[in-house]
Interface confidence: low
């Protein structure tokens, strides 16, 4: 349905509050270094313009596309060249090239200071003094640090952020009420950002066919009672929503997401029995709830897949008639029967099935050729099962911190060229899989673990793409989306790597170490561990453990000393020397 004025259409559909929030998110995700006040000014100007178009859709410039309007507005920023360098060249281009140019300059690792949380009383005062500005600041700060954050979902986070302050700033113990809520929002927000980043990478690097395959598998697991046609309709709509959000079309994305939620709630009977409690909620909460809804129960007495996909003499005929549809149906049927498999495993099985049909349907006796196709699935299924089993055993044996350290060593040996901060961030997050998934029942472990690892490894791929240093990382990241995790798992010690020269400065610590939080101390120690492995990639587990134990003892000793700085100055060089000896 075409509208005379796209901006008026979206303003009316979304309402002023959501419109302003989404425009602020869009601008903050594009111009990540701009000050808050500058963005607020731009958003207010766009909003006033939108209102004139609502009043008269024929008014001047109201017929322009959103990309044109928003791009023109971004290009009015005076300091564009000084702040963003070559991004300013985007403004010389015409749409749609200009928007593509802005998208290409989104920075997944912007050079922004970490967000510092002020005292609770300071935050509550700011909240009460100007609630609207306080919430806009939240949207701005999150969006500029996470340029692919799923915008309509960020509005939901902002609503929860507001609710937390509204409740806790009136509580007797403000901090006890507020801080756990803020911690939860921070952790959920980081997870949500990373999950969305994988969706955008999937669409941008591997195309919408890859995303649709992922969505067919996931939605078939969630909605096993829905018919294939219904799942396909949801997949088509969901692909449109995420394509729009990943492409910076945040107003269209939020509008279409609301339409999808409406459709799902109006058609619950043909989708899932689990949607009921979501559908009674207000819009933002409803959409979030639908996205996170648990898997419905599998229909009783589902027939064996073999009849239609192996035993039937029509397999090649059906495949040739509409390849993607036939493979989509296979994926749907397999996924609805296997909520215990990761989505990535299901996609690997579909890929293996496709490869078999490509080969066998050209053979003299196709049926004979593909008769054993399901047997070929066995090793594909067993590989992630064994991996999860082994790593959960290791996690239970070591605990989270030491499990992270084991992964740090493992991944530094695989790809030592990768920067130390990236290796620390990624390995720490890989290590969180233990606490997240290993406590779950057997049937939920693999989907939890492998699909979480896919999200974390995508972060490695995204950061590595910005500054490529390892051919092995590039290969694992670009060859196949579904085989990324097995590709990284299969990497061995990089024999070609020339060990890094020992730098005593890297292992020099000061008294400020003692005032760090437990998490910050861990990061310092893990940074040192990565540097040790880069210096001695062939160091044994025992050697590394010895050095890390010495390190912990040295830090503990100096943090208990009266003159901490003097202790670090004296004991530090001894620790460095002892470490060199231990690794010789």
């Amino acid at each position: 349905d075409t509208h005379k004025s796209e901006v008026a259409h979206r303003f009316k559909d979304l309402g002023e509050e959501h419109f302003k929030g989404l425009v602020l998110v869009a601008f903050s995700q594009y111009l990540q270094q701009c000050p808050f006040e500058e963005h607020v000014k731009l958003v207010n100007e766009v909003t006033e313009f939108a209102k004139t178009c609502v009043a008269d859709e024929s008014a001047e410039n109201c017929d322009k596309s959103l990309h044109t309007l928003f791009g023109d507005k971004l290009c009015t920023v005076a300091t564009l060249r000084e702040t963003y360098g070559e991004m300013a060249d985007c403004c010389a281009k015409q749409e749609p090239e200009r928007n593509e140019c802005f998208l290409q300059h989104k920075d997944d690792n912007p050079n922004l200071p970490p967000l510092v949380r002020p005292e609770v009383d300071v935050m509550c005062t700011a909240f009460h003094d100007n609630e609207a500005t306080f919430l806009k600041k939240y949207l701005y700060e999150v969006a500029r640090r996470h340029p692919y954050f799923y915008a309509p979902e960020l509005l939901f986070f902002a609503a929860r952020y507001k609710a937390a302050f509204a409740e806790c700033c009136q509580a007797a113990d403000k901090a006890a009420c507020l801080l756990p809520k803020l911690d939860e929002l921070r952790d959920e927000g980081k997870a949500s950002s990373a999950k969305q980043r994988l969706k955008c990478a999937s669409l941008q690097k591997f195309g919408d066919r890859a995303f649709k395959a992922w969505a067919v598998a996931r939605l078939s697991q969630k909605f096993p009672k829905a018919e294939f046609a219904e799942v396909s309709k949801l997949v088509t709509d969901l692909t449109k929503v995420h394509t729009e959000c990943c492409h910076g079309d945040l107003l269209e994305c939020a509008d279409d997401r609301a339409d999808l939620a409406k459709y799902m709630c109006e058609n619950q009977d043909s989708i899932s029995s689990k949607l009921k409690e979501c559908c009674d909620k207000p819009l933002l909460e409803k959409s979030h709830c639908l996205a996170e809804v648990e898997n419905d129960e599998m229909p009783a007495d589902l027939p064996s897949l073999a009849a239609d996909y192996v035993e039937s003499k029509d397999v090649c005929k059906n495949y040739a008639e509409a390849k993607d549809v036939f493979l989509g149906m296979f994926l749907y049927e397999y996924a609805r029967r296997h909520p215990d498999y990761s989505v990535m495993l299901l996609l690997r099985l579909a890929k293996a099935y496709e490869a078999t049909l490509e080969k066998c349907c050209a053979a003299a006796d196709p049926h004979e050729c593909y008769a054993k196709v399901f047997d070929e699935f066995q090793p594909l299924v067993e590989e992630p099962q064994n991996l999860v089993k082994q790593n959960c055993e290791l996690f239970e044996q070591l605990g989270e911190y030491k499990f992270q350290n084991a992964l740090l060593v493992r991944y530094t040996k695989k790809v030592p060229q990768v920067s130390t901060p990236t290796l620390v961030e990624v390995s720490r997050n890989l290590g969180k899989v233990g606490a997240k998934c290993c406590k779950l029942p057997e049937a939920k472990r693999m989907p939890c673990a492998e699909d979480y690892l896919s999200v974390v490894l995508n972060r490695l791929c995204v950061l590595h793409e910005k500054t490529p240093v390892s051919e092995k990382v590039t290969k694992c990241c670009t060859e196949s989306l579904v085989n990324r995790r097995p590709c990284f798992s299969a990497l061995e010690l990089d024999e070609a790597y020339v060990p890094k020269a020992f730098n005593a400065e890297t292992f020099t610590f000061h008294a400020d170490m003692c005032t760090l939080s437990e998490k910050e101390k861990q990061v310092k120690k893990q940074t040192a561990l990565v540097e040790l492995v880069k210096h001695k990639p062939k160091a044994t587990k025992e050697q590394l453990k010895g050095v890390m134990d010495n390190f912990a003892a040295f830090v503990e000793k100096c943090c208990k000393a009266d003159d901490k700085e003097a202790c670090f100055a004296e004991e530090g060089p001894k620790f460095v020397a002892a470490s060199q000896a231990a690794l010789a």
């Epitope: 046609a229 309709k233 509409a322 549809v325």
Partner: nanobody
Framework: EVQLVESGGGLVQPGRSLRLSCAAS????????MHWVRQAPGKGLEWVSG????????TYADSVKGRFTISRDNAKNSLYLQMNSLRAEDTALYYC????????????????WGRGTLVTVSS
């Protein structure tokens, strides 16, 4: 280039039958759901019937249920509408329309239209 060419229209008496055909070209026919949509003189468009890519999901407007039958032959890239027990109110220009999807689910998306074939039911 997508082309949809309708045929089979004409003047017919009430109670009689007519079969409309639509020849499709310029795209992979079996990758799309198809529809018949009609427009009576001086009236708006009225959706008549739709059929999914493989023919296993078919839907009809209440006004034609039990009288009209939609079908397709993917080998011949053709869509058909068998119209029985025709009434004066079936008089309209009948369009063959390609959906954007394979399926008939929710609201269809009418992506490509033919030029139409005129059916006149009169005694």
């Amino acid at each position: 280039e997508v082309q949809l060419v309708e045929s089979g229209g004409g003047l017919v008496q009430p109670g009689r039958s007519l079969r409309l055909s639509c020849a499709a070209s310029g795209f992979t026919f079996h990758h799309y759901a198809m529809h018949w949509v009609r427009q009576a003189p001086g009236k708006g468009l009225e959706w008549v019937s739709g059929i999914s890519w493989n023919g296993n999901k078919i839907t009809y407007a209440d006004s034609v249920k039990g009288r009209f039958t939609i079908s397709r032959d993917n080998a011949k890239n053709s869509l058909y509408l068998q119209m029985n027990s025709l009434r004066a109110e079936d008089t309209a220009l009948y369009y063959c329309v390609r959906d954007s999807s394979l399926f008939i689910v929710g609201a269809p998306t009418f992506e490509h239209w033919g030029r139409g074939t005129l059916v006149t039911v009169s005694s």
